[in-house]
Interface confidence: low
């Protein structure tokens, strides 16, 4: 029987009446057009909704937008369009919401063709009031807030100028011309690339990388012959053109670009690309595209300096530069990532790693599922997850996989069960242990979201027809109740809940269509009365993450330590609450070879945990580039995995000596850098 239909599923008591009392409809007085929604701050209940409607006239497009504000999580909305002087807001810039709980909002207005500059509306009180400011430039990008100080904004202009404001957009100053890309780093530092000759496109591969640490008073050139750059965790990456040909290589800095090391990664040609898939302060996952239009490449994982890389996964699906990859960080369990590979027969298969890229395996077949026709053996197959690539291919997949840091172990995704991803209609699967085991949760495609840190899961069927039913589960997707939230079905467009999955409110967005008009409508349902009481100690149970063999003393050890969590019992129907904090108890493990990656010049043969010397380097001194100097490495082939906390046990020896020689292979050596002041 389908999930939620078997006998042991009890019904949540009186839920229809409880939900009916907590269902709030809001009909927006708008023609349909487009709608965008932003949450302002954390746990404030403030939502801004911008509706825009375009009427194409013969000569030009006439646009109208309206701004609405809610301060009760979407139950009621107030039209505040007059606060922005009924101005048409440019949706391509969205609503720029300030970091943390700054309460800052910037809206970029549409201005007439001949104007000197653009116009913004600024609020620093959670959109209660707005100030209109005329800009001395036309913005090309959305205003970017400094992560450290929400008063500091940067923007690029349509003329490729880099503009900075130090007083939350009140006054602007152009600090550099001919800028291609700009990003905030840490400590209010700005990194940007500039072109010298024609344009960003013409100078690709000949750009300069600059840094300013004082908002444009002084500058330092930290790289030349730059193709592109990126920031990830504490790493600054630049892809740099080689001196002799059209290939380029990745260089890495961990000191804001003062010194650079060449990453031990393959170089790429003109048609290839590098992509930072994920990065934290410990390490980085890097995708390196294969030559030719193959649609795949190789994932490498870095050491703690971002310099030495280990091959992690072959034939990793990544279509083109800026294209689609299914790489997903499962945020509900440490060390877990899911992605897709393109197999030799061009089928797409899902792989999962539980140890931050050390080993990849197929997803275990769900207990309650049969292998589909893609499976050669009807008894042996795997779960394959639909993510960005399937969505880009217009498969019937309304949502990417979902996990939340505070809903420990829960992963929800569309998938099919076989030897590869199937083109047939997917079902929804859930894992409650971070991806080790899976269960079919819902038949057919659905939208889904997690509320109350996993205490409630909400889903809506993906249908081309109007809908009026929402499903919810209080036991991590085992049993489902259905609630008819309106008598008049709506054309559903999206589910919205406050980011962070702590809320108990869900908003269902859609539109109604009558003979002549269609209108936006939202239904906000508060589940607080379904979870009648606050959870107590007895509602939680101890769960050991990554546990695969309870008999083994090292069971649950991943990256050198194991973690026990307090998790809500599936049978408990209670509120974790907005202040819920994940309770975990870490304990350190003994080191084994699994806690080390292979050092520069070494590799792991397949299905072996020992690192062996690369044949071409046998008997040679291991010399490599570090911070523009040549280093001599004495190693028996192992280097601790970044973030690994193991102690005792195996302890391979490693020593690095400075050879006091300059590296000729490093294009970003210090003598090529210079400084200037404004």
């Amino acid at each position: 029987s389908a999930p939620g239909e078997d006998e042991e599923c009890g019904r949540v008591r009186d839920f229809v009446a409880k939900l009916a009392n907590n269902t709030h409809q809001h009909v927006f007085d708008d023609l349909r057009g487009s709608v965008s929604l932003s949450w302002v701050g954390d746990s404030t209940g403030v939502i801004l909704v911008l509706t825009t409607f375009h009427v194409p006239l013969v000569i030009m497009t006439f646009g109208q937008s309206k701004l609405y504000r809610s301060e009760d999580y979407g139950k009621n909305f107030k039209d505040i369009t007059d606060l922005i002087n009924n101005t048409f807001i440019r949706t391509e810039f969205g609503m720029a919401i300030g970091p943390e709980n700054s309460g800052k909002v910037v809206l970029t207005a549409e201005v007439s063709g001949g104007s000197r500059g653009g116009r913004i509306f600024r609020s620093s009180d959670f959109a209660k009031n707005f100030v209109q400011t005329d800009l001395p430039f036309h913005p090309l990008t959305q205003m970017m807030y400094s992560p450290q100080n929400s008063d500091y904004l940067l923007a690029l202009s349509t003329e490729n100028g880099l503009w900075v404001s130090k007083n939350f957009g009140g006054k602007w100053e152009e600090i550099h011309k001919a800028v291609c890309l700009a990003k905030w780093g840490s400590d209010n530092t700005i990194f940007f690339t500039t072109y010298a000759n024609g344009s960003c496109k013409a100078d690709l591969g000949a750009l300069e990388l600059w840094r300013t640490s004082d908002l444009g008073k002084s500058f330092k050139t930290i790289g030349v012959k730059i193709y592109s750059f990126g920031l990830g965790g504490r790493f600054l990456f630049a892809s740099v053109m080689a001196d002799k040909d059209t290939t380029r290589r990745i260089h890495v800095s961990t000191d804001q670009g003062d010194t650079w090391s060449m990453a031990q990664l393959p170089s790429v040609g003109q048609e290839q690309f590098y992509s930072i898939l994920a990065a934290n302060d410990d390490m980085v996952f890097m995708h390196v595209d294969e030559p030719g239009d193959t649609g795949f490449g190789t994932i490498f994982t870095s050491d703690d300096r971002g310099i030495v890389y280990s091959k992690s996964l072959d034939r990793h699906l990544y279509t083109t530069t800026g294209g689609e990859t299914d790489f997903t960080n499962v945020t509900s369990l440490r060390g877990v990532y899911i992605t897709s590979v393109l197999s030799e027969d061009n089928s797409i298969q899902t792989m999962i790693t539980f140890d931050q890229g050390g080993r990849w395996t197929h997803l275990r077949k769900p207990e309650n599922s049969e292998c589909d026709a893609t499976a050669k053996n009807k008894n042996e197959c795997s779960l394959h997850i639909h993510a960005s690539y399937s969505i880009s291919q217009k498969l019937n997949v309304p949502m990417a996989p979902l996990s939340e840091p505070n809903a420990v172990g829960i992963v929800i995704a569309h998938g099919s069960v076989g030897d590869a991803i199937s083109v047939m209609v997917p079902d929804v699967y859930i894992s409650d242990d971070g991806g080790y085991s899976w269960t079919k949760m819902l038949e057919g495609p659905h939208y889904y979201t997690i509320l109350d840190s996993g205490g409630i899961i909400v889903a809506i069927e993906h249908s081309s027809r109007p809908i009026n039913v929402i499903k919810f589960s209080t036991d991590e997707g085992q049993c489902w109740q259905t609630y008819t939230f309106t008598r008049d079905p709506i054309y559903f467009t999206g589910l919205a809940s406050e980011p962070g999955a702590r809320s108990m409110n869900i908003s269902i967005w859609g539109f109604t269509e009558s003979f002549l008009t269609s209108q936006w409508v939202s239904y906000t349902i508060d589940f607080k009365d379904i979870l009648e009481r606050n959870c107590e100690e007895k509602d939680y149970t101890i769960w050991l993450a990554h546990s695969t063999d309870p008999e083994d003393y090292e069971d649950g050890c991943i990256l050198g330590y194991k973690e026990q969590f307090l998790r809500l019992r599936k049978s408990s129907v209670c509120q974790n609450g907005r202040d819920y904090v994940v309770t975990k108890q870490p304990s350190i493990c003994l080191c084994s070879l699994e806690d080390f990656l292979c050092d520069f010049g070494y590799y792991r043969p397949e299905n072996d945990s020992k690192c062996v010397e690369q044949p071409e380097l046998k008997g040679h001194d291991l010399e490599f580039c570090l911070y523009g100097r040549e280093e001599h490495l004495t190693t028996n082939g192992y280097r601790k995995i970044p973030g690994d906390k193991c102690q005792g046990g195996v302890n391979p020896v490693r020593e690095v000596k400075d050879l006091k020689k300059k590296c000729t292979s490093n294009f970003l050596s210090p003598e090529k850098q210079n400084s200037k002041s404004n």
Epitope: A2, D345, N346, A373, V425, G444, S463, S464
Partner: antibody, heavy 122, light 107 residues
Framework: QVQLVQSGAEVKKPGASVKVSCKAS????????MHWVRQAPGQGLEWMGW????????NYAQKFQGRVTMTRDTSISTAYMELSRLRSDDTAVYYC???????????????WGQGTLVTVSS | DIQMTQSPSTLSASVGDRVTITCRAS??????LAWYQQKPGKAPKLLIY???SLESGVPSRFSGSGSGTEFTLTISSLQPDDFATYYC?????????FGGGTKVEIK
């Protein structure tokens, strides 16, 4: 316009093999799955499987696994279905039918070949 | 495998009649259902896909409805050209399966 033209009727003895061809025109051959469906005299329709002309990947119905081989020649936009170890109950009209584009849920058949009658008789 | 059961297997009707054919799936197939018409010696012709979407060029007297496990093909006013056999087909999961067919004959 889209056309699927199949090879002519065949008479085979039990235990033999038959190979039916299906030449596609009027669309990008490699962009769409090619399915094979058969129909025994006076009976309903039975799906046999598909081939992805782009990759050569196949997907056969369990019933035909081990006896059917689907191949393609992209240079001449032709798909083939070979059925081996023929039995008298394999007597049927065999159709090729164009499925949906790759990675789309559209496995209904807008375009069909004219059918090839395969008679298995001793 | 998903079984598709069509009823009736034979249906006698006259020109101008409203005709309804039913197709039942052994498990939910959402809206992933197609209807075909087949005449003797000819290949099937697609009429309806995704349960209710009319294939272009098909007369509007044909319509489809239903979702989950129960589906219906309706011919609002039977024409001489409509006497044929009709098949439903699910494409929710492999193997793709067809109903046994409904023969619409002249009364």
């Amino acid at each position: 316009q889209v056309q699927l033209v199949q090879s002519g009727a065949e008479v085979k003895k039990p235990g033999a093999s038959v190979k039916v061809s299906c030449k596609a025109s009027g669309y990008t051959f490699t962009g769409y799955y090619m399915h094979w469906v058969r129909q025994a005299p006076g009976q309903g329709l039975e799906w046999m499987g598909w081939i992805n002309p782009n990759s050569g990947g196949t997907n056969y119905a369990q019933k035909f696994q081990g006896r059917v081989t689907m191949t393609r020649d992209t240079s001449i936009s032709t798909a083939y279905m070979e059925l081996s170890r023929l039995r008298s109950d394999d007597t049927a009209v065999y159709y090729c039918a164009r499925g949906g584009p790759q990675l789309r849920v559209a496995e209904y058949f807008q375009h069909w070949g004219q059918g090839t009658l395969v008679t298995v008789s001793s | 495998d998903i079984q598709m059961t069509q009823s009736p297997s034979t249906l006698s009707a006259s020109v101008g009649d409203r005709v309804t054919i039913t197709c039942r799936a052994s498990q939910s197939i959402s809206s992933w259902l197609a209807w075909y018409q087949q005449k003797p010696g000819k290949a099937p012709k697609l009429l309806i896909y995704k349960a209710s979407s009319l294939e272009s060029g098909v007369p509007s007297r044909f319509s489809g409805s239903g979702s989950g496990t129960e589906f219906t093909l309706t011919i609002s006013s039977l024409q001489p050209d409509d006497f044929a056999t009709y098949y439903c087909q699910q494409y929710k999961s492999y193997p793709i399966t067809f109903g046994g067919g409904t023969k619409v004959e002249i009364k």
